[in-house]
C-alpha cells in the first residue's frame, strides 16, 4: 500500500498583518504529498533503478534522498505494505568503492544501515521496516521528491478566511 | 485514437490454463504501463496486476501471484495474461487497461473485454 | 483491503434530472478517487480522476467531490446517452479496488 495523498499547504508567517500580500505558503504540487519539508511522489509502476532516476527528472524532480534516520522512519510509516519496495537516490560507486547520493555525495555511516552487498550495479531500495541494496537492473516501485517551493499570493484579507 | 483490442471469448476445464491477448494501437506501446482488471459475475471489479512494456516489469495482486503471468510482444504491441490452475471461481470478463500516468492510479483506455468461461 | 460501498445500486431517472451517486471507502483515501461510465457490452471510460478532475473530453455536466471516505459523482442535467453503469476506484493503496457500481435507468 501507499499512503493518502492530499493537498499540502504550511502557512510559515506566524503573524498575519493587515496587507494585500497574502502570507507566503509552501506548496506541493497537486498529486505530491507533503513530508516535512519535502514533496513526494510515490510511483504506481515499476522500472529498474536508472529509469525510475530518469522519470523522476521529467517530473523535475529527484530519486529520494534520505538526510538521516529520522528521515527514514517518516518515509518508513508511509508504507503500509511490508511487501512493497522503493527504489531511493542511493547506488555503489565502484570508482569511488562507497554508496554514492545521486546529488553527489557519500552516504555516511551513521545515515542509513544497508543490508546487502556493496559492490558494482548495486542500488539501494527501501521497504516498511529496512534498507537493501538489490541489482540496479531489477525492477520496483520507486519514490520522487522534490523541495517545497514558496508561493506569494497577491489577495485581499478578505480571502484569507 | 487510443485502441485495445482483446482476443475473443475462451471457455476452459477446471485445472487448465488461459492466455487472454490485448493489441494495443494509436500510442507508443512502450509508453504506458498495461494493467490487468477482471469482473466475475455478481462481483466487483478485480484488479490482477502489471507490466511495465518497456522493461517488462510487472507487479501483481499477491492474491494471483502465483497463478498469473504477464508478458508482452512489443514487436506487435500486444499484452497477454496467462491464468493457470484455473477454478470455476476464475469465471468472469478479463479487461487490459492502460494506466494513465507512471503516478497515479488510473485507467483511462480500457479493452473491450474477454470472457472467460471455466467449467466441467 | 480497502472496500468502496456504492450507493444506489440502481437509479431511476428522467432526461434533465440531476443525480448524485455516492462511493464511500472503508479508510480514508485522500482524493486518489476515480469515476468511471461502463455502457453495456462495451469497455468503461473514464471520467473523473482525483476525486474532482475531469478527463478530456468529458461534457462538464460530470463533477465530483469529496476527499477522505466520502466522494460523490454528479450530473447536473440528464442527457440521453449518460444511462449507464457507474463506478468508482480508489489508488490510495497499490492494491486497487472498486466500487460494486450504479446502474442508472431511464425512468
Known amino acids: 500500500q501507499k499512503p493518502s495523498i492530499g493537498k499540502c499547504s504550511v502557512d510559515i508567517q506566524q503573524n498575519r498583518t493587515k496587507t494585500t500580500e497574502r502570507p507566503d505558503l509552501l506548496n506541493c504540487p497537486i498529486y505530491w504529498q507533503q513530508v516535512q519539508e519535502k514533496c513526494l511522489l510515490f510511483s504506481h509502476t515499476v522500472n529498474p533503478w536508472n529509469n525510475s532516476l530518469a522519470d523522476c527528472s521529467t517530473k523535475e524532480s529527484s530519486l529520494l534522498l534520505i538526510q538521516d534516520k529520522d528521515e527514514l522512519t517518516r518515509t518508513q510509516n508511509l508504507i503500509h505494505d511490508k511487501a512493497i519496495s522503493f527504489w531511493i537516490g542511493l547506488n555503489f560507486s565502484l570508482s569511488e568503492k562507497n554508496w554514492k547520493w545521486i546529488n553527489g555525495s557519500f552516504l555516511s555511516s551513521n545515515d542509513l544501515k544497508i543490508t546487502g552487498d556493496a559492490k558494482e550495479n548495486s542500488c539501494v531500495y527501501i521497504s516498511q521496516t529496512s534498507v537493501y541494496s538489490e541489482y540496479c537492473s531489477t525492477e520496483m516501485k520507486w519514490i520522487c521528491q522534490k523541495e517545497l517551493t514558496l508561493v506569494r499570493n497577491k489577495v485581499s484579507p478578505d480571502s484569507w478566511l | 485514437q487510443v485502441q485495445l483490442v482483446q482476443s475473443g471469448a475462451e471457455v476452459k476445464k477446471p485445472g487448465a490454463s488461459v492466455k487472454v491477448s490485448c493489441k494495443a494501437s494509436g500510442y507508443s506501446f512502450t509508453g504506458y504501463t498495461m494493467n490487468w482488471v477482471r469482473q466475475a459475475p455478481g462481483q466487483n471489479l478485480e484488479w490482477i496486476g502489471l507490466i511495465n512494456p518497456n522493461t517488462g516489469g510487472t507487479y501483481y495482486n499477491q492474491k494471483f501471484k502465483d497463478r498469473v503471468t504477464l508478458t508482452v510482444d512489443t514487436s506487435i504491441s500486444t499484452a497477454y495474461m496467462e491464468l493457470s490452475r484455473l477454478r470455476s471461481d476464475d469465471t468472469a470478463v478479463y479487461y487490459c487497461?492502460?494506466?494513465?500516468?507512471?503516478?497515479?492510479?488510473?485507467?483511462?483506455?480500457w479493452g473491450q473485454g474477454t470472457t472467460v468461461t471455466v467449467s466441467s | 483491503d480497502i472496500q468502496l460501498t456504492q450507493s444506489p445500486s440502481f437509479l431511476s431517472a428522467s432526461v434533465g434530472d440531476r443525480v448524485t451517486i455516492t462511493c464511500k471507502a472503508s479508510q480514508d483515501v485522500g482524493t486518489a478517487v476515480v469515476w468511471y461510465q461502463q455502457k453495456p457490452g462495451k469497455a468503461p471510460k473514464l471520467l473523473i480522476d482525483w476525486a474532482s478532475i475531469r478527463h478530456t473530453g468529458v461534457p462538464s455536466r460530470f463533477s465530483g467531490s469529496g476527499s477522505g471516505t466520502e466522494f460523490t459523482l454528479t450530473i447536473s442535467s440528464l442527457q440521453p446517452e449518460d444511462f449507464a453503469d457507474y463506478f468508482c476506484?480508489?489508488?490510495?493503496?497499490?492494491?486497487?479496488?472498486f466500487g460494486g457500481g450504479t446502474k442508472l435507468e431511464i425512468k
Open positions: 476506484q480508489q489508488y490510495s493503496t497499490y492494491l486497487y479496488t
Open positions: 487497461a492502460r494506466l494513465g500516468d507512471n503516478y497515479r492510479g488510473y485507467f483511462d483506455s
